[in-house]
Interface confidence: medium
């Protein structure tokens, strides 16, 4: 089991630093995003992990983004942001279609409600209970 | 970005001490609040103590000092406690808080704890 | 608990030469890793994150590299203001932890 714990974390760390580097290979992005999406959980460890991605940094005053299935729906009040960007998003992902675009990385607003907890924990014990 | 401590601490042994960080600049709420010890003298090592989510006010401890340090917030005045308690010469250093978003990329000026009889 | 072991401890160098401080870690910190500077009296710096992204404001002639367990921070073209402390810390898994530190004189 530690073996394996070991393995897919490497999987998926190798699919943090490459996210969306690649428009053709999105499997892994895809089954990265229904993760977050259903375990309500962001990154590895942490949110910050998206940071590190070249395409998802900010730079200076502009925002740090992440992937759109960070979004904690429950703790976003803005109705722009629900309709516009995140809603539409998520239910690509909720149905596991299998298109992707360019729109599904969404800027970390002030207060950043996004998922506070990294994945680690929740795959963890999915693995554990498996 | 300016993390602000408070000032320098004389204790004696047994004794506890609070030392605040008040941040400004940016969105307290939005990134996780470090504690960093840093021993003075010839052994300059930096020691992670743990760290707070504003937001929610989970922490996570270094097991090293679980017992030893307790973290908080007080999110309308935008500032970060830590309180260590039952004093020893060990405790002696200089503590800082430091803001991460993944790393430490802001840090406080640090607060010089003394613990002497 | 993660182990790092920072090299070398301490180094002498000119103004205008290229040095080299490598930082090993006992596990896989992948690519959690950064670089701090510290002058004396002063807080630290962060310099490098994630292993190669160099920190806002931080000149270009310094380069962080590596991932896994190895790393490096090179300095090229030392200028006097580099002289201070360096410190590497992996944020990979509780508790995070910190290098010795290296000492670097600008002769």
């Known amino acids: 089991r530690a073996q394996l714990e070991r393995s897919l974390r490497d999987v998926v760390e190798k699919t943090i630093q490459k996210y969306g580097t690649n428009p053709e290979e999105t499997a892994a992005e895809e089954s990265w995003d229904y993760v977050q999406f259903q375990l309500r959980c962001c990154g590895w460890h942490y949110p910050q992990d998206w940071f590190q991605v070249l395409i998802l940094r900010g730079n200076g005053s502009e925002a740090h983004r992440v992937p759109c299935s960070c979004y904690n729906l429950s703790a976003t009040n803005d109705s722009t942001i629900l309709d516009k960007v995140i809603l539409p998003q998520l239910s690509r992902l909720g149905h596991l279609a299998r298109s992707r675009h360019s729109a599904d990385i969404c800027a970390v607003p002030a207060e950043s409600h996004i998922y506070r907890e990294g994945c680690a924990q929740g795959l963890q014990k999915w693995l554990h209970n498996n | 970005v300016q993390l602000q401590q408070s000032g320098p601490e004389l204790e004696k042994p047994g004794a506890s001490v609070k030392i605040s960080c008040k941040a400004s600049?940016?969105?307290?709420?939005?990134?996780?609040m470090n504690w960093v010890k840093q021993n003075n003298g010839k052994s300059e090592r930096l020691e992670w103590i743990?760290?707070?989510?504003?937001?929610?006010?989970?922490?996570t401890y270094n097991r090293k000092f679980k017992g030893k340090a307790t973290l908080t917030v007080d999110k309308s005045s935008s500032t970060a406690y830590m309180q260590l308690k039952s004093l020893t010469s060990e405790d002696s250093a200089v503590y800082y808080c430091?803001?991460?978003?993944?790393?430490?990329?802001?840090w406080g000026q640090g607060t010089s704890v003394t613990v002497s009889s | 608990d993660i182990q790092m072991t920072q090299s070398p401890a301490s180094l002498s160098a000119s103004v205008g030469e290229t040095v080299t401080i490598t930082c090993r870690t006992s596990?896989?910190?992948?690519?959690?890793l950064a670089w701090y500077q510290q002058k004396q009296g002063k807080s630290p710096q962060l310099l490098v994150s994630?292993?190669?992204t160099l920190a806002e404001g931080v000149p270009s002639r310094f380069s962080g590299s590596g991932s896994g367990t190895q790393f490096s921070l090179k300095i090229s073209s030392l200028q006097p203001e580099d002289s201070g402390s360096y410190f590497c810390?992996?944020?990979?898994?509780?508790?995070?932890?910190f290098g010795g530190g290296t000492e670097l004189e600008i002769k």
């Open positions: 430091a803001r991460s978003v993944g790393p430490m990329d802001y």
């Open positions: 600049g940016y969105s307290f709420t939005g990134y996780n």
């Open positions: 743990g760290n707070i989510d504003p937001y929610y006010g989970g922490t």
């Open positions: 596990e896989n910190v992948y690519s959690y």
């Open positions: 994630f292993a190669k």
């Open positions: 810390q992996h944020h990979s898994d509780n508790p995070w932890t």
